[in-house]
């Protein structure tokens, strides 16, 4: 009866063909291939991307949809015009031919066309709705992308300003470093110059010291010669006086015995008959060198050579190696006899060492070592002690075995610090040890919790600075 055929042409339009008898009607309608089919749903709440989607692509698609809409509208209008024209022609023809059944066919065709039109219209409405949805979605996407872009731009600006700040800071620091380097170079140069000047000065001082030492030696020799001459003269005068005072009738005129003129220690002085406390001149055997020492002729049988005394803080004990070597202070008051003399003396025979101590509360104590000697200067006057007795502690406050002697300019202790500088005074420091009788002198009520006082730990404990100390030696067999 009637036959519908649907096919595709080269430009992608749908071709509708109606065949009826000798008449055939062909309608070309556009296909909505670019539209999203309703079977593929659009997810509106998808995760927002950081970078925009292909913006141009979306715009193109939108334009294509608009074009399709326009085309569809035009086609509908043409179709309506065409149907109207056709209907008119057909009606004229039917009237002319008066063919009754042809009218029925035309009405059927018209109906089909109207149905087709309605279908197209419905499809177009759907497309229009889809286009609106798509447009809204695209607008939202564009807004999101715009926000994202703004955010990124802000971040970039922030980072750029941060980079600029860092670059400024870096250049400032570079300048500062360069300035410091320049300053450092200048300082090094000035230090080098000062060092050179000091070296020149030191060498000059060394030569002056050498000359002075030579002069001292000469003066000492001259002095001893003069003393001998003086002694000889005195002896001669005494002899003459004795001879003159002796009557002519005397059968055996006697010459007064010449007294022993040199004593090595106070024990010899005591044995020679001088039994009163006081300052005496001592001389080592086979030596012209003399030292003035205080002799205690009363304590414990007498004959004690005082090698150290502290009593009132009148003498500074923060002295150099050389001063501790030769001695310093006042023998009738505070003094240090001298390491060289004591070393030589205690290596000639066996000596005992007695240390007498006084606190601020009126108490007294002592430590007695039955054997004491000092090594030579080459061995830093190391102290050697044996056999402790006494009331100033059962344990020796002078570290055992003995340590080398240290002064402010000769660090021979076992400490990572410099004990002589930290605790003041020269002593046989350990690290730094339980004693220092050459520390700072502190008066009463200021003598506790002291880090650098006159210390004898095993009697008064740490931090207690004593009122008085005396170190004395005497031959072991006295």
């Amino acid at each position: 009866y009637n036959n519908f055929r649907k096919s595709m042409d080269s430009i992608g339009k749908k071709q509708y063909q109606v065949q009826h008898g000798s008449c055939s009607y062909t309608f070309l309608l556009p296909e909505m291939d670019n539209c999203r089919s309703s079977s593929s749903p659009y997810v509106s709440n998808a995760v927002q991307r950081d970078a925009p989607l292909e913006y141009d692509d979306s715009v193109q698609r939108l334009q294509v949809l608009e074009n399709i809409m326009e085309n569809n509208t035009q086609w509908l209008m043409k179709l309506e015009n065409y149907i109207q024209d056709n209907m008119k022609k057909e009606m004229v023809e039917i009237q002319q031919n008066a063919v009754q059944n042809q009218t029925a066919v035309m009405i059927e065709i018209g109906t089909n066309l109207l149905n087709q039109t309605a279908e197209q219209t419905r499809k177009l409405t759907d497309v229009e709705a889809q286009v609106l949805n798509q447009t809204t979605r695209l607008e939202l996407q564009l807004l999101e992308h715009s926000l994202s872009t703004n955010k990124l731009e802000k971040q970039i600006l922030d980072q750029t300003s941060e980079i600029n700040k860092l670059q400024d800071k870096n250049s400032f620091l570079e300048k500062k470093v360069l300035a410091m380097e320049d300053k450092h170079i200048i300082q090094l140069q000035s230090i080098k110059e000062e060092k050179d000047q000091l070296q020149v000065l030191v060498s000059k001082q060394n030569s002056i010291i050498e000359e002075l030492e030579k002069k001292i030696v000469t003066a000492t020799v001259n002095n001893s010669v003069l003393q001998k001459q003086q002694h000889d003269l005195m002896e001669t005068v005494n002899n003459l006086l004795t001879m003159m005072s002796t009557s002519n009738s005397a059968k055996d005129p006697t010459v007064a015995k010449g007294e022993q003129i040199s004593f090595r220690d106070c024990a010899e002085v005591f044995k020679s008959g001088h039994t009163t406390n006081g300052v005496y001149t001592l001389t080592l055997p086979n030596s012209t060198e003399e030292v003035k020492a205080y002799c205690d002729m009363e304590a414990g049988g007498g004959g004690w050579t005082i090698i150290q005394r502290r009593e009132d803080g009148s003498v500074d004990f923060q002295r150099t190696w050389k001063e501790y070597k030769v001695g310093f202070g006042n023998p009738s008051g505070e003094y240090w006899l001298g390491n060289e003399f004591v070393s030589q003396l205690t290596n000639q025979q066996r000596y005992v060492l007695k240390i007498h101590l006084k606190d601020w509360e009126g108490n007294e104590a002592y430590s007695l070592y039955e054997h004491f000697y000092l090594s030579s200067e080459e061995l830093n006057y190391r102290i050697h002690l044996k056999g402790l007795t006494g009331t100033a502690g059962k344990i020796s406050s002078i570290s055992q075995p003995g340590n080398d002697f240290s002064t402010k300019d000769a660090d021979n202790d076992k400490c990572i610090c410099k004990c002589s500088q930290m605790l003041t005074g020269g002593w046989w420091f350990d690290a730094c040890g339980p004693s220092n009788l050459n520390g700072m002198y502190y008066p009463q009520r200021q003598n506790t919790n002291k880090f650098n006082g006159i210390k004898w730990y095993y009697w008064k404990g740490s931090g207690y600075s004593l009122k008085g100390t005396t170190m004395m030696i005497r031959p072991a067999g006295f």
């Epitope: 400490c415 990572i416 690290a431 919790n449 880090f451």
Partner: nanobody, 129 residues
């Protein structure tokens, strides 16, 4: 003048805790080591713990390891001894004392008692039920 003042002692039951404080004046903790010592009746004074604030080093006697903790607050010039799991044998007078941080023998880490020259008056800790 250097002063050390202990506080925080008292009576506590076995297993209990106490925190002793040692307030130091006249010196800065950066240059000194502070030690805690104790002396029980009829016994010698013994070292308990010590701290060197400059390097953050600490020392503990074997008898208190794991129970006592020493710490310092340099801004307050104060050293603390936190004592936990106390035992009756911890009963003693506790003293804090100071020593110049540099007064160390080569190769040694800590100081003999006689090197501590500044002492506090002590605070009594009694551990008894």
């Amino acid at each position: 003048d250097v002063q050390l003042v202990e506080s925080g002692g008292g009576l506590v039951q076995p297993g209990g805790s106490l925190r002793l404080s040692c307030a130091v004046s006249g010196i800065t903790l950066d240059d000194y080591a502070i030690g805690w010592f104790r002396q029980a009746p009829g016994k010698e004074r013994e070292g308990v713990s010590a701290i060197r604030s400059s390097g953050g080093s600490t020392y503990y006697a074997d008898s208190v390891k794991g129970r006592f903790t020493i710490s310092s607050d340099n801004s307050k010039n104060t050293v603390y001894l936190q004592m936990n799991s106390l035992r009756p044998e911890d009963t003693a007078v506790y003293y804090c004392a100071a020593v110049p941080a540099g007064r160390l023998r080569y190769g040694e880490q800590w100081y003999p008692i006689y090197e501590y020259d500044a002492w506090g008056q002590g605070t009594l800790v009694t551990v008894s039920s």
